[in-house]
Amino acid sequence: FNISGCSTKKLLWTYSTRSEEEFVLFCDLPEPQKSHFCHRNRLSPKQVPEHLPFMGSNDLSDVQWYQQPSNGDPLEDIRKSYPHIIQDKCTLHFLTPGVNNSGSYICRPKMIKSPYDVACCVKMILEVKPQTNASCEYSASHKQDLLLGSTGSISCPSLSCQSDAQSPAVTWYKNGKLLSVERSNRIVVDEVYDYHQGTYVCDYTQSDTVSSWTVRAVVQVRTIVGDTKLKPDILDPVEDTLEVELGKPLTISCKARFGFERVFNPVIKWYIKDSDLEWEVSVPEAKSIKSTLKDEIIERNIILEKVTQRDLRRKFVCFVQNSIGNTTQSVQLKEKRG
């Protein structure tokens, strides 16, 4: 097909030879094609213009990517010729850096439904070069970690050596979606949640006397959980006495919250104190009853077939422990009156 009518965008990928990094190209079809096409349900039927130039299908992967060989040969289908480049919906992922990725990439709808659709395409001229600026030794990594529950920030690797004052306006994307409020070279996160994880893209424009380029970098952001600094806490029993009926069966539950540890060896057990004697009780297995990314609530019950007079003189102690320390909670049984 004739690509002379395609809109053109120039991009620069400066990669670090020290680190593994990825790169992405978005199929930036002119609006409203893009919204109709790559982001399903952005336009409600009422919002669709009467004469939409391009009416593709709603299939999110319904764009075709090509590379234009530099020798003038016909366009090549990306999927057939380039195993290190993968298409995900409207995005092209480059899994390995290298100057051999330089070239022209064209995306257009798979389905051509009207004469208007022929020109519904984007040509991206990608220049790839290794980073030569040795003065910026501590540029931000293309893999950045955020600690769950704390404050953090995501830095644009290609701008991390510049101060906020001299930094150009930056366009940020997260998982292919525009983050319209972010314009600086750093995204500040007040409190890190698990959903902050993802693939972030930062773009800024660099111009010379001849032309302007979009400089792009991709950051893989992971949320991480630090090992707990706390010993486990016992949530139940809360009271240290428990009213019971003699001769009746009784179950006492011990529930404890354990914080995450990479080496996780929680201990939860019951033992009985009777005057100077102390012994551990064989009780049913402990079971995890609630889970989050940062902690685990584990329960273990002690079961008495029937409460005796002797049990009223004993203390039932729940003992919990992790690598930081231990906690106990004792329960004294008291006969219910009336």
Partner: nanobody, 123 residues
Framework: DVQLQESGGGLVQPGGSLRLSCAAS????????MGWYRQTPGKQRELVAA???????TYQDSVKGRFTISRDNANRTANLYMNSLKSEDTAVYYC?????????????????WGQGTQVTVSS
């Protein structure tokens, strides 16, 4: 690793009821949504009902008013209450859970399936 265990399938007469239960087990994980899907021979798996961690639900049109999905407070179990069962409800029912887990300190996504439980509606 997070795993799912389904129970409650079986043979039931038209108009009867069944309760399917799906329990997630593992350490340091959160579930965003749990759902029940069904599949009949030669057909694709289809969503029957789903419930998110905040309790919002979605149902396939053909089961609305007959099936109810619920979850426990700890978000580890999803139950599907099936009433007024019809022969076309006969299928293998699969539980699905979507969430995140803590893999040695790194938060990772998961989307897992149970092994499936057979529901047969027949007189």
């Amino acid at each position: 690793d997070v795993q799912l265990q389904e129970s409650g399938g079986g043979l039931v007469q038209p108009g009867g009821s069944l309760r399917l239960s799906c329990a997630a087990s593992g350490r340091f994980f959160t579930i965003n949504a749990m759902g029940w899907y069904r599949q009949t021979p030669g057909k694709q798996r289809e969503l029957v009902a789903a419930i998110t961690s905040d309790g919002s639900t979605t149902y396939q049109d053909s089961v609305k008013g007959r099936f109810t999905i619920s979850r426990d407070n700890a978000n580890r179990t999803a139950n599907l209450y099936m009433n007024s069962l019809k022969s076309e409800d006969t299928a293998v029912y699969y539980c699905n859970a979507d969430g995140r887990f803590n893999d040695n300190g790194y938060v990772k996504n998961f989307n897992i399936w149970g092994q499936g439980t057979q529901v047969t509606v027949s007189s």
